[in-house]
């Protein structure tokens, strides 16, 4: 999806919130792991 | 997902069409407004998303415009109506948006509203 | 612009046969597209997204494929409830865009 159509404002939009979304998942677990270890 | 605010109107009447979504947030998910004339197929309007920004068809023009009035509801304004514009509008949820597939569908459909535009 | 074009606009099948409806798209897509059925009085209903995933709940009967601008719906063992309107929409871009649907497939059961 890197190029073509793919450009598109709303795509564009789609893109970042999938983005954010999949860091705080990341970054959620991280920090579960992190507490749990302790 | 239902809509309401459909009726019989003269050609140039203002009319704002009201989705009222529940079971969910608009706060998370992306709303659309599709419209289909008798008989004839399925013809995107636009798009809300999340933050309230807006997207629409190449068609609309400035005509209609799409806004959220409360965290349940999602209103279509329409105006400079003609008779073209005589046709069932549905409101649809948007799909989720993921890594690897942002693109978008729609996924859950309310029943429609029909505006009928007549002299 | 992204154009969607859809056939045959009417196909005709018997019960148990087998139904093929094309979609093409005028630019790359990708795997970008969704497949919809309608019924006469009621709203749409997602089948297919990402030209090949079945939405929850629908029938294996519903096949999607291809990626880029040529796509597909087989409809395998056709039943009377199949009788509908389908149509595909890709879901590539929605700014400024003109129709992201195609123009529909009338599939009628013998």
């Known amino acids: 999806h890197s190029d073509g159509i793919f450009t598109d404002s709303y795509s564009r939009y789609r893109k970042q919130m999938a983005v954010k979304k999949y860091l705080a998942a990341v970054l959620g677990k991280r920090y579960k792991q992190r507490v749990k270890n302790k | 997902v239902e809509e309401s605010g459909g009726r019989l109107v003269t050609p140039g009447t203002p009319l704002t069409l009201t989705c009222t979504v529940s079971?969910?947030?608009?706060?998370?998910?992306?709303m659309s407004w599709v419209r289909q004339a008798p008989g004839k197929g399925l013809e995107y309007i636009g798009i809300?998303?999340?933050?309230?920004?807006t997207w629409y068809a190449s068609w609309v023009k400035g005509r209609f415009t799409i806004s959220k009035t409360s965290s349940t509801t999602v209103d279509l304004k329409m105006t400079s109506l003609t008779t073209e514009d005589t046709a069932t509008y549905f409101c649809?949820?948007?799909?989720?948006?993921?890594?690897?597939?942002?693109?978008?569908?729609?996924?859950?459909w309310g029943q429609g509203t029909l505006v009928t535009v007549s002299s | 612009a992204l154009v969607m074009t859809q056939t045959p606009s009417s196909v005709s099948a018997a019960v148990g046969g087998t139904v093929t409806i094309n979609c093409l798209a005028s630019q790359n897509i990708y795997n970008s597209l969704a497949w919809y059925q309608q019924k006469p009085g009621q709203p749409p209903k997602l089948l297919i997204y990402?030209?090949?995933t079945l939405a929850s709940g629908v029938s294996s009967r519903f096949k999607g494929s291809g990626s880029g601008t040529q796509f597909t719906l087989t409809i395998s063992g056709v039943e009377c409830a199949d009788a509908a309107t389908y149509y595909c929409q890709q879901g590539a871009g929605a700014d400024n865009i003109g129709n992201p649907f195609g123009g529909g497939t009338e599939v009628v059961v013998k």
């Open positions: 809300i998303n999340t933050n309230d920004d």
């Open positions: 649809a949820r948007i799909s989720d948006a993921y890594v690897f597939d942002y693109a978008y569908y729609f996924t859950l």
């Open positions: 079971g969910f947030s608009l706060s998370s998910y992306d």
């Open positions: 990402r030209a090949s």
